[in-house]
């Protein structure tokens, strides 16, 4: 089936926005006013995955860019990266596992768990201007809770 997608922005629970930091990295920082235009707009696609009544599998692409967040092992550690894809073939309903995140909604907050690496989550640091990364702990120093803002197409 044609994949269903929506455009959105994400902010962590401390209200930090996500912006590009170089060609293949995202960072989280507080933005205000006109600077809000810097935040990345995601194209969130609803894909096949190990869906449950609590988890919805999604892929997170950057709107109008052929870049997707993906999870891979680097030096034996699950790592978040921005991966370039062929725009003719993506997005698709049957995304490879490294591109899939389980979107989990708890108390109006969202978590994004890697399908490839269960219990590893899209995370931000408490500190300003630090890279968005894949973290293996929840409820610690690092932030794994996000809110989603819909963006009209």
């Amino acid at each position: 089936a044609p994949v269903r997608s929506l455009n959105c922005t994400l902010r962590d629970s401390q209200q930090k926005s996500l912006v590009m930091s170089g060609p293949y990295e995202l960072k989280a920082l507080h933005l205000q006013g006109q600077d809000m235009e810097q935040q990345v707009v995601f194209s969130m696609s609803f894909v096949q995955g190990e869906e449950s009544n609590d988890k919805i599998p999604v892929a997170l692409g950057l709107k109008e860019k052929n870049l997707y967040l993906s999870c891979v092992l680097k030096d034996d550690k699950p790592t978040l990266q921005l991966e370039s894809v062929d725009p003719k073939n993506y997005p698709k309903k049957k995304m490879e596992k490294r591109f899939v995140f389980n979107k989990i909604e708890i108390n109006n907050k969202l978590e994004f768990e890697s399908a490839q690496f269960p219990n590893w989550y899209i995370s931000t640091s408490q500190a300003e201007n630090m890279p968005v990364f894949l973290g293996g702990t929840k409820g610690g120093q690092d932030i794994t809770d996000f809110t989603m803002q819909f963006v009209s197409s």
Epitope: Q48, N53, E96, K97
Partner: antibody
Framework: QVHLKESGPGLVAPSQSLSITCTVS????????VSWIRQPPGKGLEWLGL???????YYNSPLKSRLSIRKDNSKSQVFLKMNSLQTDDTAVYYC????????????????WGQGTSVTVSS | ETTVTQSPASLSMAIGEKVTIRCITS??????MNWYQQKPGEPPKLLIS???TLRPGVPSRFSSSGSGTDFVFIIENMLSEDVADYYC?????????FGAGTKLELK
């Protein structure tokens, strides 16, 4: 060789709960999901829900409040529990293995057990 | 939820005849349709998996076609051993949904 076998009580009294065990061999429950399906006498197939390799579950909405699926990976067993049974829950209950091929056919089912017949009657 | 409408409900065919069963889905499911055969007292057996792929060991007289919302299952030359119930299953999205089934009998 993939094999699934259901074992259940046969007869259940109305308003009581049903417990069925699916014992599998030839594949690991950590790698593949298992679905439950039922078939009332002379009728068609109804998909009840599934448990994935990682342990997450998905229940079909009409039965969600009455269903529970869990598993024991080390014993290669999947358990279906259904509460508050009524006569229209009389059916053959099947477990089936998910194909679980990422990026290809995640939701399809290939191998089925023989089924266990459950009659709800006082 | 994707609804699957299967037709006909029953078929009476002579040996050697061509059998055609159709399933229509309420949403576009690409090629994610599966076809099962069920004989009395037995569990369903997967004949054709998504992508119109014949399963290993299944005779070549069985085939299917279709994508999107319209799917057809064909038995090219019916044999007596093909008497059974046949079901389609969409595996595009959860919850998985079956067609109501087609009872194939011998004329």
């Amino acid at each position: 060789q993939v094999h699934l076998k259901e074992s259940g009580p046969g007869l259940v009294a109305p308003s009581q709960s049903l417990s069925i065990t699916c014992t599998v061999s030839g594949f690991s429950l950590t790698d593949y999901g298992v679905s439950w399906i039922r078939q009332p006498p002379g009728k068609g197939l109804e998909w009840l829900g599934l448990i994935w390799g990682g342990g997450d579950t998905y229940y079909n909405s009409p039965l969600k409040s009455r269903l529970s699926i869990r598993k024991d990976n080390s014993k290669s067993q999947v358990f279906l529990k259904m509460n508050s049974l009524q006569t229209d829950d009389t059916a053959v209950y099947y477990c089936a293995k998910q194909r679980t091929l990422w990026g290809y056919d995640l939701y399809g089912m290939d191998y089925w057990g023989q089924g266990t017949s459950v009659t709800v009657s006082s | 939820e994707t609804t699957v409408t299967q037709s006909p409900a029953s078929l009476s065919m002579a040996i050697g005849e061509k059998v055609t069963i159709r399933c229509i889905t309420s949403t576009d499911i690409d090629v994610d349709m599966n076809w099962y055969q069920q004989k009395p007292g037995e569990p369903p057996k997967l004949l054709i998996s998504q992508g119109n792929t014949l399963r290993p060991g299944v005779p070549s007289r069985f085939s299917s076609s279709g994508s999107g919302t319209d799917f057809v299952f064909i038995i090219e030359n019916m044999l007596s051993e093909d008497v059974a119930d046949y079901y389609c299953l969409q595996s595009d999205n959860l919850p998985l949904t079956f067609g109501a089934g087609t009872k194939l009998e011998l004329k």
